[in-house]
């Protein structure tokens, strides 16, 4: 079982390999001096059906270095950074792990791209192994919230508060149900 030629990369190089490319072979990508690698640099030849070989992920890309690029602090609820620190410049990567009792969906690493956004995939998410729900939020005096149901709310959902005419909302307008089963903030109040 073997893999076909690894996907090419513009403005970069692929590590040496011999053919046929055996299952288990790793090839590594790197970029020319003025370019930055975005994505996983190592691809692995695997087989999913014990018949054909395939590369385990897409090739990374080489972006022309933008010295002005900088990315915001990436936040993964239920997770924490195991690699990477601010400031985040073009080509820098951040790797996440999930807290105990959370499992990861998506790719654990992201890269700061020339467009100041993390990529090439979305930030991973950490999902509770024991699906927790947030308790019902109370109604507030002289105001109301979007969730009229009295039951608990699933993580990832949010509740928006608003005040009646003539009243000012003090506190958070939108409160998110976190994967920990806790609300992101206490309910606001409506004051005259």
């Amino acid at each position: 079982i073997s893999c076909g030629s690894p996907p090419p990369i513009l403005n970069g190089r692929i590590s040496y390999y011999s053919t046929p490319i055996a299952v288990g072979t790793v090839i590594r990508y790197s970029c020319s001096g003025t370019f930055r690698l975005i994505g996983e640099k190592s691809l692995l030849c695997i087989t999913k059906d014990k018949v054909d070989g395939t590369w385990d992920k897409p090739a990374p890309k080489c972006e022309y270095f933008n010295k002005y690029s900088s990315c915001p602090e990436p936040i993964v609820p239920g997770g924490y950074k195991i690699r990477g620190s601010t400031p985040y410049r073009h080509g820098d990567s951040v790797t996440f792990a999930c807290k105990t009792n959370f499992s990861m969906n998506g790719n654990k690493s992201v890269w700061c791209q020339a467009n100041n956004m993390w990529g090439p995939t979305r930030l991973p998410t950490c999902v509770s192994v024991f699906p927790l729900e947030c308790p019902a939020l109370p109604m507030i005096h002289n105001g109301h919230h979007t969730s009229e149901n009295v039951g608990s709310i699933a993580p990832g959902l949010s509740v928006t508060y608003s005040c009646e005419s003539g009243y000012l909302l003090v506190g958070e307008k939108i409160i998110n149900c976190l994967s920990s089963g806790k609300w992101s903030a206490v309910p606001p109040t409506c004051e005259e």
């Epitope: 590590s15 040496y16 288990g24 190592s42």
Partner: antibody, heavy 119, light 106 residues
């Protein structure tokens, strides 16, 4: 940090086989590759082969092809290296070493297992 | 197999001085090179990877440089605990190690 604990020293006769184990604790066994590296007395390090436990894929250095078998038991987070048709030149300390994902370099090493081949 | 050659085989340096160890690859390996330290009776310990990135917990006096076929490990001010054998390892095409450089007290 991942801890790798290897089985104890072995004395073997020429022509026989030896099986060394390497138990990992900490981290996720499925997220890394385990290599076996040996070191003959007073000599340098020699890569023998490696396995990616989650895939069950093992690859071997040409020199050891056909004589070494590397396996892994995901349920016990243990990797094994079996070397057959032993000869005196196989007397060495055998190390297991871990690379995170498929990084290529070894963050963690076992304590080593001395295998002595003598008649 | 990519052949890795280290020089010198033995290097004698006084504590507090600078030590420079060399590693040459038989073909270009980009920056896919790691350095390890090994003391008698112990397993190797990762110092540097990707030619110049220090591993977690490695003191700043250790630095790596180079790309392609020529690489250097520099220890800026030798401490007593730095006297050991140092190995380079390539991971451009499978894996192979240099024969080692023994760093001894002058």
């Amino acid at each position: 940090q991942v801890q790798l604990v290897q089985s104890g020293a072995e004395v073997k006769k020429p022509g026989s086989s030896v099986k060394v184990s390497c138990k990992a604790s900490g981290g996720t066994f499925s997220s890394y590759a385990i290599s076996w590296v040996r070191q003959a007395p007073g000599q340098g390090l020699e890569w023998m082969g490696r396995i990616i436990p989650i895939l069950g894929i093992a690859n071997y250095a040409q020199k050891f092809q056909g004589r070494v078998t590397i396996t892994a038991d995901k349920s016990t987070s243990t990797a094994y290296m079996e070397l057959s048709s032993l000869r005196s030149e196989d007397t060495a300390v055998y190390y297991c070493a871990r690379e995170e994902d498929i990084s290529g370099y070894y963050q963690d090493w076992g304590q080593g297992t001395l295998v002595t081949v003598s008649s | 197999e990519i052949v890795m050659t280290q020089s010198p085989a033995t290097l004698s340096v006084s504590p507090g001085e600078r030590a420079t160890l060399s590693c040459r690859a038989g073909q270009s390996i980009s920056r896919y090179l790691a350095w390890y330290q090994q003391k008698p009776g112990q397993a190797p310990r990762l110092l540097i990877y990707d030619a110049s990135t220090r591993a977690t917990g490695i003191p700043a006096r250790f630095s790596g440089s180079g790309s392609g076929t020529e690489f250097t490990l520099t220890i800026s001010s030798l401490q007593s605990e730095d006297f050991a054998v140092y190995y380079c390892q390539q991971y451009e095409y499978w894996y192979s190690f240099g024969q080692g450089t023994k760093l001894e007290i002058k």
